[in-house]
């Protein structure tokens, strides 16, 4: 379902990744050098920035993100 | 700098009303939600709800629905919380404190209120 | 309701002591974790946010870590101004919900 609206409630922040907040809404996301193999599947839907540098991604599927705007 | 001034001590008697002021400083005011805490003498910290300035809008903790009431007046800049049909178990710390992606920055000095008869 | 556990609930260290306190959460909180430091008469201030972002002008020794439903927050070199009370706070459902708290001692 989705999020109630609060400013009390933290957004989505894939497991191990660095996250910051950008703004009332979104969410700025590092998830840099983690040795990942695949991308983080909890992404939230208010996600404005994503780093996936320095990782093990060799290929994306067709709409890896469905889940961001 | 940030700063959310509240109200002074106040003292009061069981089935009376406290309004607690939380006037806000060095922010725009409508941009940041803002939130309501109490602490019980030696107790811990309870999320009593929040407001979002720029159209009132609000969330209670279940616990704190009804005799709690949340409110704004923007052109002050300030945050209300009014409680009524006080009981002693409502003797705590009140706190404001500011909000925006889930997290609360700059707190209040908080406000004592004291009900006894 | 998210419940939150912290331990201990207090603590004596010594200044130059590294210092570890838990909060466990009752259910999968995601990362959505902060960290607050409390002090008689001052201000609540915020420490960490999202488990492990540190706030603006928070020293380097505190750091947060932690996932699923247990997190701890770290204090490397404990300095004279450190004792104080510390809560951990949940923001993955509403209520937002707070730790017992610990509250640091000087040995």
């Known amino acids: 379902g989705s999020s109630p609206r609060s400013g009390v409630l933290l957004r989505g922040c894939p497991t191990h990744c660095h996250c910051e907040p950008d703004g009332r809404m979104l969410l700025r996301v590092d998830c840099s050098d983690l040795g990942l193999s695949e991308l983080p599947s909890n992404l939230s839907v208010f996600t404005s920035y994503l780093d996936l540098s320095m990782n093990n991604i060799s290929q994306l599927l067709p709409n890896p993100l469905p889940s961001l705007r | 700098q940030v700063q959310l001034v509240q109200s002074g001590s106040e003292l009061k008697k069981p089935g009376a009303s406290v309004k607690v002021s939380c006037k806000a400083s060095?922010?725009?005011?409508?941009?940041?939600?803002m939130q309501w805490v109490r602490q019980a003498p030696g107790q811990g910290l309870e999320w009593i709800g929040e407001?979002?300035?720029?159209?009132?809008?609000?969330n209670y903790n279940q616990g704190f629905t009804g005799r709690f009431v949340l409110s704004v007046d923007t052109s002050v800049s300030t945050a209300y919380l009014q409680i009524s049909s006080l009981k002693a178990e409502d003797t705590a710390v009140y706190y404001c404190?500011?909000?925006?992606?889930?997290?609360?920055?700059?707190w209040g000095q908080g406000t004592t209120v004291t009900v006894s008869s | 309701d998210i419940q939150m556990t912290q331990s201990p609930s207090s603590l004596s260290a010594s200044v130059g002591d590294r210092v570890t306190i838990t909060c466990r959460a009752s259910?999968?909180?995601?990362?959505?974790l902060n960290w607050y430091q409390q002090k008689p008469g001052k201000a609540v201030k915020l420490l960490i946010s999202?488990?492990?972002r540190l706030h603006s002008g928070v020293p380097s020794r505190f750091s947060g870590s932690g996932s699923g439903t247990d997190y701890t927050l770290t204090i490397s070199s404990l300095q004279p101004e450190d004792f104080a009370t510390y809560f951990c706070?949940?923001?993955?459902?509403?209520?937002?919900?707070f730790g017992g708290g610990t509250k640091l001692e000087i040995k």
């Open positions: 060095g922010y725009t005011f409508t941009n940041y939600w």
């Open positions: 407001i979002d300035p720029s159209d009132s809008y609000t």
């Open positions: 404190a500011r909000s925006l992606s889930g997290y609360v920055d700059y």
């Open positions: 706070q949940q923001g993955n459902s509403l209520p937002p919900t």
């Open positions: 259910q999968d909180i995601s990362n959505r």
């Open positions: 999202y488990r492990s």
